[in-house]
Amino acid sequence: EEGLQVIQPDKSVSVAAGESAILHCTATSLIPVGPIQWFRGAGPGRELIYNQKEGHFPRVTTVSDLTKRNNMDFSIRIGNITPADAGTYYCVKFRKGSPDDVEFKSGAGTELSVRAKPS
């Protein structure tokens, strides 16, 4: 299981305000069992963007269907991007734990920059 890698192929993505941003992430293995979460920023103050395990995130949709049992594509689409969404986004794999899941491995991050809406 130590061989699992979280791959974020894009170092940076640039999106016009009002458009959608696709942030790519794949895992190289189904093991260990546990959810993927997306965060903006790193460290204790990071902002949760999407949690595969819990909740509904209205601006975020997954590119693939995560209910399919062998899915390893955890890319997300964030709608209606604004300048406030700029930052570095991390795709993070968690290992199932009790009582709480444990952070296992993070992708290298994708920097999202927001261009002014074309006039």
Partner: antibody, heavy 120, light 107 residues
Framework: QVQLVESGGGVVQPGRSLRLSCAAS????????MIWVRQAPGKGLEWVAS????????YYADSVKGRFTISRDNSKNRLYLQMNSLRAEDTAVYYC?????????????WGQGTMVTVSS | DTVLTQSPDSLAVSLGQRATINCGAS??????MHWYQQKPGQQPKLLIY???NLEAGVPSRFSGSGSGTDFTLTISSLQAEDVAVYYC?????????FGQGTKVEIK
């Protein structure tokens, strides 16, 4: 094997309260989101409320918002539905069901249901 | 809210024949449509998840298709034990909603 057993149903007068319970066994309860769904006599299924695995995310149907409260105790493997200010239209069989992981997942196991009758 | 409309409301099919149930959504639910079977006096049972995936233990005569707003549940060769009410349900966004149900009987 997976088991969900509801209890706490019965006959209650309008305006009164009732607390339903769902005892879970045969799986790791704390891994699953849980749902209450109801079915009025001779009618279809209506989602009532859902709660995520750690209780961080809770949603209610508009028809019960402000009157019903869903909760869970992962240490006891139990799901609850506190029903206040009951109305005649709340009369139904109440089912608990489990949902693996996040919001988009289906309800893969259901209990047998408990009947709630609201009548004066 | 996403309204789900099933058609027909009831369906009588001869044993061994194909039964088809449709579910239309008032807006796209992507592939997050699930199908349940409810036999008289029993709790619902998951048959198909995410439009086309057969739940473990469900006979292969059941299949699902569709995406977006139009979905279909097909029973390729109806058996006596398939007499039930079938419901579609979306999990694309809250609130979760169900179709009104389709009653399948033997002709």
């Amino acid at each position: 094997q997976v088991q969900l057993v509801e209890s706490g149903g019965g006959v209650v007068q309008p305006g009164r309260s009732l607390r339903l319970s769902c005892a879970a066994s045969g799986f790791t309860f704390s891994d699953y989101g849980m749902i209450w769904v109801r079915q009025a006599p001779g009618k279809g299924l209506e989602w009532v409320a859902s709660i995520s695995s750690s209780s961080s995310y809770i949603y209610y149907a508009d028809s019960v918002k402000g009157r019903f409260t869903i909760s869970r105790d992962n240490s006891k493997n139990r799901l609850y539905l506190q029903m206040n200010s009951l109305r005649a239209e709340d009369t139904a069989v109440y089912y608990c069901a489990r949902r693996y992981y996040g919001f988009n997942y289906p309800f893969d196991y259901w209990g047998q249901g408990t009947m709630v009758t609201v009548s004066s | 809210d996403t309204v789900l409309t099933q058609s027909p409301d009831s369906l009588a099919v001869s044993l061994g024949q194909r039964a088809t149930i449709n579910c239309g959504a008032s807006k796209s639910v992507r592939t997050y449509m699930h199908w349940y079977q409810q036999k008289p006096g029993q709790q619902p049972k998951l048959l198909i998840y995410s439009a086309s995936n057969l739940e473990a233990g469900v006979p292969s005569r059941f299949s699902g298709s569709g995406s977006g707003t139009d979905f279909t549940l097909t029973i390729s060769s109806l058996q006596a034990e398939d007499v039930a009410v079938y419901y579609c349900q979306q999990s694309n966004e809250p609130p979760y909603t169900f179709g009104q149900g389709t009653k399948v009987e033997i002709k």
